[in-house]
């Protein structure tokens, strides 16, 4: 296993609709044709997998149908979007990139993006 640099933004604020987007960029050391991207969430020293996708270079990123993540790839850059976030989902979201094929296998883990989610205030009942 060889190490690889990964960069991502330090902080992102989710939209009022609970959507957060960020870029994950990796320093590809060679001609990888198969790449796996995983988003991990770290909160209270617990790390859980949020979503993962494997893609072939030049093809779209495909997450499972029930995934809360969507994404697009462009070269060694992945644009990730996480949906359905609530305030309780605030945490550090870490981008993990693996170059699966051809060998050698490379692994890169970013420093994480702190995503802040603020639940919208419910609208007060209005009397007309």
């Amino acid at each position: 296993c060889k190490a690889m640099h990964v960069a991502q933004p330090a902080v992102v604020l989710a939209s009022s609709r609970g959507i957060a987007s960020f870029v994950c960029e990796y320093a590809s050391p060679g001609k990888a044709t198969e790449v796996r991207v995983t988003v991990l969430r770290q909160a209270d020293s617990q790390v859980t997998e949020v979503c993962a996708a494997t893609y072939m270079m030049g093809n779209e990123l495909t997450f499972l149908d029930d995934s809360i993540c969507t994404g697009t790839s462009s070269g060694n850059q992945v644009n990730l979007t996480i949906q359905g976030l609530r305030a309780m989902d605030t945490g550090l979201y870490i981008c993990k990139v693996e170059l699966m094929y051809p060998p050698p296998y490379y692994l890169g883990i970013g420093n994480g993006t702190q995503i802040y989610v603020i639940d919208p205030e419910p609208c007060p009942d209005s009397d007309f």
Partner: nanobody
Framework: QVQLVESGGGLVQPGGSLRLSCASS????????VGWFRQAPGKEREELAC????????DYPGSVKGRFTITRDNAKNTVYLEMVNLKAEDTGVYYC???????????????????WGQGTQVTVSS
């Protein structure tokens, strides 16, 4: 749109040195990571070096590490490849390529670059 033009190639003796330049005649290069590649006759294109947008991150394959150095001058819109102790096997057409990135990293994979120059010929021979 960024357009790349390589220069600085030529005939050099074994053990000699060259400095190649990659200049942009379109957009400013500072939003782009830049890579250098070469293609020798009858061989696949080979990665040589890359440099991130700010110049703080560079990467090289083991085959040229210590002999080739990539630098950039964003004020001059130019990326350089300094090559020393050249060998006959360094002969080929040298290309620079650019990729617009958000952060400071770069890639050694030709698959990641979408803009390429026309190339400059380097011949190492006595």
């Amino acid at each position: 749109q960024v357009q790349l033009v390589e220069s600085g190639g030529g005939l050099v003796q074994p053990g000699g040195s060259l400095r190649l330049s990659c200049a942009s005649s379109g957009d400013t290069l500072e939003s782009f990571a830049v890579g250098w590649f070469r293609q020798a006759p009858g061989k696949e294109r080979e990665e040589l070096a890359c440099i991130g947008r700010t110049g703080e991150f560079t990467d090289y394959p083991g085959s040229v590490k210590g002999r080739f150095t990539i630098t950039r001058d964003n004020a001059k819109n130019t990326v350089y490849l300094e090559m020393v102790n050249l060998k006959a096997e360094d002969t080929g057409v040298y290309y620079c390529a650019a990729e617009r990135l958000v952060f400071h990293l770069c890639s050694l994979s030709e698959y990641d670059y979408d803009t390429w120059g026309q190339g400059t010929q380097v011949t190492v021979s006595s």
